[in-house]
Amino acid sequence: NKILVKQSPMLVAYDNAVNLSCKYSYNLFSREFRASLHKGLDSAVEVCVVYGNYSQQLQVYSKTGFNCDGKLGNESVTFYLQNLYVNQTDIYFCKIEVMYPPPYLDNEKSNGTIIHVKGKHLCPSPLFPGPSKP
């Protein structure tokens, strides 16, 4: 038995930040779980982890180079990614594992979310504007 995960197909980070919501076909209330966010088609790079259990507050871990926060809903974990760089544009996959109570459960691989990080294109005003046309 596998948990199903729904993610937005694409998100655009205009201000170098984005909220990626991972929606699960499973209620995480009073469960011990580990939710993670993986970068790349092969999910090779785990960038954020949210660990939760019934007795302590949510714990969030960010890999070096990523600024991550996490928020828990009954059937969702939202990853808030900040200070993203243009070169972090990629596909990101949500993963969930539930350890307790038994049985151990994890998810079917989701379709992922393409996060497109838009660079800030600032147009500098010229110091010495040319002669104005009549």
Partner: nanobody
Framework: EVQLVESGGGEVQPGGSLRLSCAAS????????MGWFRQAPGKGREFVAA????????DYAESVKGRFTISRDNAKNTVYLQMNSLRAEDTAVYYC?????????????????WGQGTLVTVKP
């Protein structure tokens, strides 16, 4: 809940070697990391080395690179620290830590559980 038990500490002469072990038990997820930190008398706990479950990510403190090697046996849920060319400044209590992060974190705050520590003494 995760329990960590360290072993392998002892007294050794400068230039000598020791191998520390840390066995983890409890509920494990598909990825996590374990690391070694050390605390010399009167100093804070400092990062030594870490490795993740997949064994595709390891990290070392600059002061131990080339001398210490971290490895793990996933079947035994055990991580090892092979310490060669030991120096007097390596004398400390060595602690094993466990984190739910899936990478070799050097941040002490990322570690959720700690072992009781094992003393390493390097002296002539």
């Amino acid at each position: 809940e995760v329990q960590l038990v360290e072993s392998g500490g002892g007294e050794v002469q400068p230039g000598g070697s020791l191998r520390l072990s840390c066995a983890a038990s409890g509920r494990m997820f598909s990825n996590y990391a374990m690391g070694w930190f050390r605390q010399a008398p009167g100093k804070g706990r400092e990062f030594v080395a870490a490795i993740n479950y997949r064994r595709d990510d390891a990290d070392y403190a600059e002061s131990v690179k080339g001398r210490f090697t971290i490895s793990r046996d996933n079947a035994k849920n055990t991580v090892y620290l092979q310490m060669n060319s030991l120096r007097a400044e390596d004398t400390a209590v060595y602690y094993c830590g466990f984190t739910y992060a899936g990478w070799a974190s050097s941040r002490r705050d990322d570690y959720n559980y700690w072992g009781q520590g094992t003393l390493v003494t390097v002296k002539p």
